[in-house]
Interface confidence: medium
């Protein structure tokens, strides 16, 4: 490049020369000194001067340059007779985030300038989400065809998920980077040998208030005829907050007749357009053989026969449990598979997820909800999310 | 725009059955709920009986459960409500309308149960 | 099933009055409220639907609001052709069902 200019080896920095005094000189020096909240650490003042051999050297340290450590602002503590001052620190997490550690999140320095932990070491703690603890949770005195609007955000595991065909369906955060849905929705508009490499690019996902989601892949039940379950992997784990949060699994199973369970979807409503706002009911678990009989006949493997009152049969077997509509009958209805059956267990203030709805025709003519048992998928789920 | 026209009514006896059509014209309905909705003489608006498009799920007062049967053509854009076992607080007269917000009304035929 | 209650049943207004008419759910409905007119021999038309909108063709002088159970219908500058019967409904779960009617004349 052509400048024009004559170029030297002295950049300019844009300092202007100082004037010259008389009988005097202009000596070269310059301070360095930290950003916001890093601190200086040198044994001399930080300020450098410019010798006959162009090297910047300090009267004290010579020519070795200071370092910018981090500033806790943490003063020195007192020291006491005949003690000393060990250093420790507690690592907390931020809200809405659990520290997950066998240890007690204390660690302390030891000799060789490790921080260790008295049970685990060297080895870290983690900050995991918390799951099943809605800041504002639905209120019990309050389709899905009719139920409430979750004005309140009491469902931050309920995310939204929408076919290639502008379906819309349910699926349910378990962690940061994992949802649970039901095969049929992965499988919605696809024919029966699509992969789920095939699958996993037609979908959207939005949780929260509508934030989208990337989909990395989807995994589908190894029993997905029988086990109407799916998993979907997240290319990123979301962020938890107030309007995000997974919903705990549970470690016991709540799916006892006549528990409530509330359920949150973005199905079809009573004039079968798909909810702008996401709905909830509350709806009992049902006696199983009663369910039976009302989608077979009997429960009598041999005298069974087709006579579900929506024309479609839902799988029922060990892995599914039943919910019956609201006395106001409110009910599940399109659209809504893939929600959580949530269950709040009051002793521990958590919500569980006991169900994930997969038989959503019911909409107000059949009498029951089918729900596949998540202890039935537990283990699967588990050990899916490990390998992946 | 849609227009809907019914079809029917008349003069039975207690205890008879009738049926009611109603003609879509104009527009498809077959993508939207369809409402049968009944007001007797003097009286205030009652809802009677829903359909769901496809598939076609049904939904009925409780004063008509049992009695009445709603129906629908989607190939001829039509409606139906069955009727049997006719009371004479049936006697009113039938509007059908469509979606379960009822944006569009037809002109309503006269049933009335008299012996 | 969900009732529906309006206030007040009949009322007699005048020309350019405005007027407002009051519909409670039993029980929370959201917005899933229309609110109907109907004239004497006429056919019900509907005014207003998801609690506030107003449906094409109708004078901007009626205007609903309200959500969960609390619902008003406003006329805010009566006209002669306003005299009828307005009916709320709510279609929210079945079974539907229509609030019992607010009688307006002119005086």
């Known amino acids: 490049v052509d400048s024009g200019n004559d170029v030297t080896d002295i950049a300019d920095d844009g300092c202007p020369k100082p004037p010259e005094i008389a009988h005097g000189y202009v000596e070269h020096s310059v301070r360095y000194q930290c950003k916001n909240y890093y601190k200086l650490r040198t044994e001399g003042d930080g300020v450098y001067t410019l010798n006959d051999k162009k090297q910047w050297i300090n009267k004290a340290v010579g020519d070795k340059l200071p370092e910018c450590e981090a500033d806790d602002g943490c003063p020195k503590p007192p020291e006491i007779a005949h003690g000393y001052v060990e250093h420790s620190v507690r690592y907390q997490c931020k809200n809405y985030y659990k520290l997950r550690t066998e240890g007690d999140g204390v660690y302390t320095l030891n000799n060789e300038k490790q921080w260790i932990n008295k049970a685990v070491g060297d080895k870290l703690p983690e900050c995991e989400a918390v799951c099943g603890k809605p800041k504002n949770p639905a209120n019990p005195v309050q389709r899905i065809l009719g139920g409430h609007l979750d004005a309140k955000g009491s469902f931050p595991w309920q995310a939204k998920m929408v076919s290639h065909h502008n379906l819309t369906t349910g699926a349910t955060l378990i962690n940061e980077q994992w949802l649970l849905t039901t095969a049929k929705n992965l499988f919605l508009n696809h024919s029966e040998n699509a992969t789920a490499k095939d699958i996993a690019p037609t979908l959207t996902l939005y949780v929260g208030k509508k934030q989208l989601v990337e989909i990395e892949k989807v995994v589908l039940h190894p029993n997905y005829s029988q086990v109407d379950i799916g998993l979907i992997k997240l290319k990123q784990k979301v962020s938890v907050n107030e309007r995000v949060m997974p919903i705990c699994l549970p470690s016991k199973d709540y799916a006892e007749v006549g528990r409530v369970g509330y359920v949150s979807g973005w199905g079809r409503n009573a004039n079968f357009k798909f909810t702008d706002h996401l709905k909830y009911v509350m709806l009992p678990v049902a006696d199983q053989d009663q369910c039976i009989r009302h989608y077979e006949g009997s429960t009598v493997p041999e005298k069974k026969t087709p006579k579900s009152p929506v024309g479609v049969q839902p799988i029922l077997n060990e892995h599914t449990f039943c919910a019956g509509m609201s006395k106001y009958q409110e009910d599940t209805c399109y659209g809504d598979a893939g929600s959580a059956f949530a269950v709040h267990d009051l002793e521990e203030d958590t919500w569980y997820a006991t169900g994930i709805l997969s038989f959503d025709k019911s909409c107000a003519v059949a009498e029951y909800g089918v729900y596949v048992k998540v202890t039935s998928i537990q283990d699967w789920v588990q050990k899916t999310i490990a390998e992946n | 725009e849609v227009q809907l026209l019914e079809s029917g009514g008349g003069l039975v006896q207690p205890g008879g059955s009738l049926r009611l059509s109603c003609e879509a014209s104009g527009s498809s309905v077959s993508s939207h709920f369809m409402t049968w909705v009944r007001q007797s003489p003097g009286k205030g608006l009652e809802w009677v009986s829903s359909?769901?498009?496809?598939?076609?799920?049904?939904y009925y007062a409780n004063s008509v459960k049992g009695r009445f049967t709603i129906s629908r053509d989607n190939s001829k854009n039509m409606l139906y409500l069955q009727m049997n076992d006719l009371r004479a607080e049936d006697t009113a007269r039938y509007y059908c309308?469509?979606?379960?917000?009822?944006?569009?009304w037809g002109q309503g035929t006269m049933l009335t149960v008299s012996s | 099933d969900i009732q529906m209650t309006q206030s007040p049943s009949a009322m007699s207004a005048s020309v350019g009055d405005r007027v407002t008419i009051t519909c409670r759910a039993s029980?929370?409905?959201?917005?899933?409220l229309a609110w109907f007119q109907q004239k004497p021999g006429e056919v019900p038309k509907r005014l207003i639907y998801d609690a506030s909108s107003l449906q094409s063709g109708v004078p901007s002088r009626f205007s609903g609001s309200g959500s969960g159970t609390e619902f008003t219908l406003t006329v805010s500058n009566l006209q002669p052709e306003d005299l009828g019967t307005y009916y709320c409904q709510h279609y929210y779960t079945f079974p539907l069902t229509f609030g019992p009617g607010t009688k307006v004349d002119i005086k």
């Open positions: 309308a469509r979606r379960s917000d009822f944006d569009t």
């Open positions: 029980r929370y409905i959201g917005k899933d």
């Open positions: 359909i769901s498009p496809n598939p076609a799920y049904t």
